[in-house]
């Protein structure tokens, strides 16, 4: 059962700027008199189905009105999602004998964009290089998790990584930042050798990766950094 009783709302993820459908299921074999959709307890739309002609749809919330649509089964479709669409939605299906309530919680998540790494590195006289790397994405919120990996091992569970690299005992080493939320992930790799190579003191550049529309395009090399984008 896709739609839920009011006690346990169905949690639905929407992506900022895209569309989402809140699925509605009808009571089997019963004639529906009307359907009311509510957003945060405020009326959104009132629908009167007809057997022989198109349903009457009264949109009662002008704010979301232009972005509202309904499927043949009166599921709610919301397009061009905004952060303020986050919240509680309810559909009440009224029949001759009963009223069925379906509840939803809509969460709007951002597609992650523009992953970048800032580097502050220091090369010591003993030839070891201390890397201080900071990873960020545009408009990050608490739902974005960051981690740093090298050779499949997690080196950090936060946007920052501090690591020492010794070219005499380590072969070329890539450090990869992975930023992830429920709807997308981005990764960006930097080379220790290129960051530390041949300079006594580095105040490194900022490396930026631009999202690749087609993930199959693979790597986008940007100086000493390269990145992946997944949806």
């Amino acid at each position: 059962d896709a739609s839920q009783s009011s006690l346990t709302p169905l949690m639905v993820n929407g992506i900022l700027g895209e569309s989402v459908t809140l699925p509605l299921e009808f009571p089997a074999g019963e004639k529906v008199n009307f359907i009311t959709w509510l957003f945060n307890e405020t009326s959104l739309a009132f629908i009167v189905p007809h057997e022989t002609k198109s349903p009457e749809i009264h949109v009662t919330n002008p704010k979301q009105g232009k972005r509202l649509n309904f499927t043949q089964s009166y599921s709610l479709q919301l397009s061009n999602l905004k952060m303020e669409d986050t919240g509680s939605y309810r559909a009440q299906i009224s029949t001759k004998t009963s009223a069925k309530l379906s509840s939803y919680t809509l969460r709007i998540l951002r597609q992650l964009r523009n992953i970048q790494v800032t580097n502050h590195s220091q090369l010591f006289q003993n030839m070891t290089c201390e890397l201080h790397l900071t990873c960020s994405v545009e408009d990050a919120d608490d739902n974005v998790s960051f981690r740093w990996e090298a050779l499949g091992n997690t080196l950090s569970s936060q946007p920052n990584l501090t690591v020492s690299w010794d070219p005499r005992i380590s072969s070329e080493q890539d450090y990869t930042c992975i930023a992830e939320n429920a709807v997308s992930n981005l990764s960006f790799s930097v080379s220790a050798q290129k960051l530390c190579g041949g300079r006594s003191s580095l105040e490194g550049p900022r490396f930026e990766g631009k999202p690749i529309p087609n993930p199959l395009l693979g790597l986008d090399s940007t100086r000493t950094g390269h990145h992946h984008h997944h949806h």
Epitope: N143, S145, W148, S157, Q158, P159, N160, T162, N181, A182
Partner: antibody, heavy 118, light 108 residues
Framework: QIQLVQSGPDLKNPGKTVKISCKAS????????MNWVKQSPERGLKWMGW????????TYADDFKGQFAFSLETSATTAYLQINNLKNEDTAAYFC???????????WGQGTTLTVSS | EVVLTQSPTTMAASPGEKITVTCSAS???????LHWYQQKPGFSPKLFIY???ILASGVPARFSGSGSGTSFSLTIGAMEAEDVAAYYC?????????FGAGTKLELK
């Protein structure tokens, strides 16, 4: 090996303040965030939030905003949980847990039992 | 928040019996972010199965994990006395991070 050692059990009066410590060893402290988790018979395991051990920035779950404070002593590789204005319902076991990559609670402290009673 | 519903709440099993504990999520979860913890009485929880199906170090091969979307499970191929514990599922992709209420496994 990785170890998280917490301070011992505590008995406090309502209205008082308690500070629980979590001493980390066996890994680079500033590379892995530290979670705090509350466990009580009534509510089970509840994530309280975490602190970024690199820059000290805390993130609190909604239920734990205001009365609770996370802090660090980086040089001592120690994280702290402070609970102010103690209430009876704060009676619980509190755990620190090292954040992993996709695993949020890879290593746990042994827990600190806090009893709030007059 | 994402609610994780575990069932059963308590279960008594005989040695050698096959056990399945389920964890149902109120929102779909990427399999990389669903984990299981074991907690024995008087001890802290311990990471047991991570990323839905990977056994943590030292976990016996009689344990397995599976699932996707909103439905996940932990299975013990043949129950042993040392498996008596509480088992918790946990999701790590939505804030706040949440745990299931736990399944207490006892020996018959």
């Amino acid at each position: 090996q990785i170890q998280l050692v917490q301070s011992g059990p505590d008995l406090k009066n309502p209205g008082k303040t308690v500070k629980i410590s979590c001493k980390a060893s066996g890994y680079t402290f500033t590379n892995f965030g530290m979670n705090w988790v509350k466990q009580s018979p009534e509510r089970g395991l509840k994530w309280m939030g975490w602190i970024n051990t690199y820059n000290g920035k805390p993130t609190y779950a909604d239920d734990f905003k205001g009365q609770f404070a996370f802090s660090l002593e980086t040089s001592a590789t120690t994280a702290y949980l402070q609970i102010n204005n103690l209430k009876n319902e704060d009676t619980a076991a509190y755990f620190c847990a090292k954040r992993g990559g996709t695993v949020d609670f890879g290593y746990w402290g042994q827990g600190t039992t806090l009893t709030v009673s007059s | 928040e994402v609610v994780l519903t575990q069932s059963p709440t308590t279960m008594a099993a005989s040695p050698g019996e096959k056990i399945t504990v389920t964890c149902s999520a109120s929102s779909p979860i990427s399999s990389n972010f669903l984990h299981w913890y074991q907690q024995k009485p008087g001890f802290s929880p311990k990471l047991f199965i991570y990323r839905t199906s990977i056994l943590a170090s030292g976990v016996p091969a009689r344990f397995s994990g599976s699932g996707s979307g909103t439905s996940f499970s932990l299975t013990i191929g043949a129950m042993e006395a040392e498996d008596v514990a509480a088992y918790y599922c946990q999701q790590g992709i939505y804030m706040p991070l949440t745990f299931g209420a736990g399944t207490k496994l006892e020996l018959k």
